[in-house]
């Protein structure tokens, strides 16, 4: 690849559009670039209404390799023609483009969560943002996975209304004095690869019975 020319093939960049905490985040990585850009500018237009490319204000001359497009990309039906420009000082190093269709290209990152273990149950507190744009609701199911001693159980809590505010789910009928691990993720359709959260684990405290059994020994 000649670095004088800014017209790299689109394979120079790898893009990913993710729903992170119900925000549309476009991130990118550069492939085989020996000159690292000092900054980037992101531009886009809508395919059904092609106009001049519009600069994304909060992603103009940015040093970050991601851009929050929640307030720009409001439709899951439209295709957004996206151009990423990479600069070193005043020199344009490259330009990559790609079309995004949120309904099919979006990946869904797991929400933040906390767990608290009790004798025979675990409280799972899932943190959703207080307000979620209607356009970014998608058709998502929350899945909570419980793992213990090699056995995995899936819980699909029914969430009334949309996924906003904090949500608590109780995994009950658990065995005291046992280690349990929990992972959460958002499922869009059966066919889409899911991104599971890292496991959070807790050793449940011993119950009354096991305590009396221990003292009897």
């Amino acid at each position: 690849i000649s670095y004088d020319s800014p017209d790299y093939t689109d394979e120079s960049c790898t893009f990913k559009i993710s729903l992170r905490n119900f925000r549309s985040i476009l991130s990118w990585e550069l492939k085989n670039h020996s000159i690292v850009p000092t900054h980037y500018t992101l531009l886009y237009t809508i395919m059904s209404k092609p106009e001049d490319l519009k600069v994304v204000k909060n992603c103009a001359n940015t040093t970050r390799s991601f851009c929050d497009l929640t307030d720009e990309w409001r439709s899951t039906h439209e295709a957004y023609v996206t151009v990423l420009e990479g600069f070193s000082g005043n020199t344009t190093l490259f330009s990559c483009s790609h079309n995004f269709w949120l309904a099919i290209d979006m990946s869904f990152e797991p929400p933040e969560f906390e767990i608290v273990g009790f004798t025979n149950h675990i409280n799972v507190m899932v943190k959703f943002p207080s307000i979620v744009e209607e356009e970014l609701q998608f058709d998502l199911s929350l899945v909570i996975e419980e793992q213990s001693e090699g056995i995995v159980k899936k819980h699909k809590p029914e969430i009334k209304g949309n996924m906003s505010g904090n949500f608590t789910y109780i995994i009950d009928k658990l065995i005291p004095n046992t280690n349990y691990c929990v992972s959460v993720y958002l499922e869009h359709s059966d066919e889409q690869a899911v991104i599971k959260s890292p496991l959070k684990c807790t050793l449940l405290p011993p119950g009354q019975e096991s305590e009396s059994a221990e003292s009897a020994k």
């Epitope: 395919m47 295709a79 309904a103 099919i104 990946s107 209607e134 058709d139 889409q192």
Partner: antibody
């Protein structure tokens, strides 16, 4: 110019599987999703599903889950659809079509699948 | 699933005369983004489908302006101001708002 070139007609026995292909040319293949649509005499046009050629994400019509499997090979700009456990009811013309968003703007020429013993 | 109902099933028209096809959806195709995701296509005999109209009324490039699309919400119409011989075939409406995408049953335009 934009072209979606589909594989040739298939005559297959009941119970077997068939894999049909759709090769895109004249545009950046990974900028457009590929959809599959079935046309049979009984059912007019039926949308089978869509695959994101860049992300690999798929969305199937529930009716075709377990029947159709969509895949994509970016290196050859080709999308594939495998149809499993074929019966006479699967005899139809299968079209691929591309979309960037909500509308199918170019269609392949169709692949005829005939299931007969 | 969204049901798309087209009428009539068959339309016999004299060349030079107007034609009109109706399409009704069981759910609104108007999205929160303000757009309505209703499309029309034509399948000429022995050919693959070809898109004519998208977003209710936008004509595809190369489509003559004798074709017009109109409607909103759940009721849509495709009109041909003066039918020509090349217009014969089967017309389908389809929606791209709700998965699974669904098609109307088709309207066959015949030349009298």
């Amino acid at each position: 110019q934009v072209q979606l070139q589909q594989s040739g007609p298939e005559l297959v026995r009941p119970g077997v599987s068939v894999k049909i292909s759709c090769k895109g040319s004249g545009y950046t293949f990974t900028d457009y999703a590929i959809h599959w649509v079935r046309q049979s005499h009984a059912q007019s046009l039926e949308w089978i599903g869509v695959i994101g050629t860049y992300s690999g994400n798929r969305n199937y019509n529930q009716k075709f889950k377990g029947k159709a499997t969509m895949t994509v090979d970016k290196s050859s700009s080709t999308a594939y659809m495998e149809l499993a456990r074929l019966t006479s009811e699967d005899s139809a013309i299968y079209y691929c079509a591309r979309s960037a968003g909500y509308s199918l703007d170019f269609w392949g020429q169709g692949t005829s699948v005939t299931v007969s013993s | 699933d969204v049901v798309m109902t087209q009428t009539p099933l068959t339309l016999s028209v004299t060349i030079g005369q107007p034609a009109s096809i109706s399409c009704k959806s069981s759910q609104s195709l108007l999205d929160s983004d303000g757009k309505t995701y209703l499309n029309w296509l034509l399948q000429r005999p022995g050919q693959s489908p070809k898109r004519l109209i998208y977003l209710v009324s936008k004509l595809d490039s190369g489509v003559p302006d004798r074709f017009t699309g109109s409607g909103s919400g759940t009721d849509f119409t495709l009109k041909i101001s003066r039918v020509e011989a090349e217009d014969l075939g089967v017309y389908y409406c389809w929606q791209g708002k709700h998965f699974p995408w669904t098609f109307g049953g088709g309207t066959k335009l015949e030349i009298k």
